[in-house]
């Protein structure tokens, strides 16, 4: 945030940039948290825009019995690997077809035993405050579906009558990693020393990191005709004086008519 300065007072202003602001010859360049001519004001909202999507990665191992292992399968550029990958991907796309969060599979390693397939199942969902629940549910469905297919699609009398057959006991879920996104934590961190006073409120499922000085939210402080200003001790109302009134009180809701005060004063004389 920047404010331009013209005229003789500019040199003085340069040395007076506050809160880590830097002078660029014309104005104070303020760090993210501040604005104003001297970077003296604290912003009332911080952009913590969430990512559009959140991803999860499940590390799984399955054992394919319908393909004979050869050393060429270790070479990811070999025809054997490419064909195996194509078929395995097709098979997994069928297995997980009912999961909206399913993106695909990525084979990380093939090893002997018939073919032990170490792979990642990739999941993705649109960001909503419930993304953790959505992805947790999706990972459970993945576990159910892979367990089911590796139990059902097995060799019978040395014949595999499916796209692929599996060893029922070779199915394992090693690890589940979900991209972490914690708006409350991000908000606190970005608000730095004002972290105690900034909160996350949701609007249309989007998180907003705001202080009580930001109008229009449930935590917003009503300063009436005054101005809300953030300080290290929290939000405060700076009350104004108009031509006719003085305002006071914690929310500047107490107005005193100047004429009454002046009139009272003159009356004493």
């Amino acid at each position: 945030r920047t404010t331009t300065c013209f005229g003789d007072g500019c040199q003085n202003t340069a040395s007076r940039c506050k809160n880590g602001g830097t002078w660029d010859g014309l104005k104070c360049q303020c760090p993210n948290l501040y604005y104003g001519e001297l970077c003296e004001e604290v912003v009332s909202s911080i952009d913590i825009g969430p990512p559009e999507t959140i991803s999860a990665q499940m590390e799984l191992t399955v054992t394919v019995t319908s393909v004979k292992f050869t050393e060429e399968l270790k070479n990811h550029s070999s025809q054997e690997f490419q064909e195996f990958k194509q078929t395995f991907t097709e098979q997994m796309n069928i297995v997980y077809s009912g999961i909206p969060e399913y993106v695909g599979v990525n084979i990380t390693k093939l090893r002997l035993g018939s073919v032990v397939v170490e792979h990642d199942v990739l999941l993705r969902t649109k960001y909503t405050p419930e993304y953790k629940t959505v992805l947790d549910n999706a990972t459970e469905v993945v576990k159910e579906k892979i367990t089911k297919v590796t139990t059902q699609q097995i060799m019978i009398n040395d014949i595999c009558s499916d796209m692929m057959c599996f060893n029922t006991t070779g199915t394992q879920v090693q690890n589940i990693t979900v991209t972490q996104y914690d708006p409350e934590e991000d908000c606190r961190k970005m608000a730095k020393e004002y972290g105690d006073y900034f909160v996350v409120e949701y609007r249309d499922q989007k998180p907003y990191c705001i202080s009580p000085c930001e109008p229009g939210f449930s935590v917003s402080k009503n300063c009436n005709l005054g101005k809300c200003q953030m300080s290290l001790s929290g939000p405060q109302c700076l009350c104004v004086t108009t031509e006719t009134h003085w305002y006071s009180g914690e929310t500047c809701n107490q107005g005193t008519q100047k004429s009454l005060v002046y009139g009272h004063h003159h009356h004493h004389h």
């Epitope: 019995t65 319908s66 393909v67 050869t70 025809q79 064909e83 194509q86 078929t87 097709e90 014949i159």
Partner: nanobody
Framework: EVQLVESGGGLVQPGRSLRLSCAAS???????MGWFRQAPGKEREGVAG???????GYADSVKGRFTISKDNAKNSLYLQMNSLRAEDTALYSC???????????????????RGQGTQVTVSS
């Protein structure tokens, strides 16, 4: 990527024989190979399959009449069709599995490469 080209189809009278060939662009030694057919308005069905070690399997409707074989040296697959019937009329295509596929039979799932097909019409 394996390219498969079928030949040998045509019009034949019931009871007669026909031999279909399928030329593959790559090594078929370590592949399951198969023949499929699709009649107008019907689903595609597996006719015959052969594993890399020569074990064969047939659909019930063609058992005893059709014989599948392969020539690894020529990268070719064959289907000898005897005692042809009107219900054998269909587009016949050959197919190949991924390398090192085991436990094959004549069902469709093993195969990832397929040819365009050759038409067989059995009619008097």
């Amino acid at each position: 990527e394996v390219q498969l080209v079928e030949s040998g189809g045509g019009l034949v009278q019931p009871g007669r024989s026909l031999r279909l060939s399928c030329a593959a662009s790559g090594d078929i030694t370590r592949r399951c190979m198969g023949w499929f057919r699709q009649a107008p308005g019907k689903e595609r069905e597996g006719v015959a399959g052969i594993s890399e070690d020569g074990i064969t399997g047939y659909a019930d409707s063609v058992k005893g009449r059709f014989t599948i074989s392969k020539d690894n040296a020529k990268n070719s697959l064959y289907l000898q069709m005897n005692s042809l019937r009107a219900e054998d009329t269909a587009l016949y295509s050959c197919a190949a599995s991924i390398l090192n596929r085991v436990g094959c039979r004549q069902l469709s799932y093993e195969y990832i490469y397929r040819g365009q097909g050759t038409q067989v019409t059995v009619s008097s």
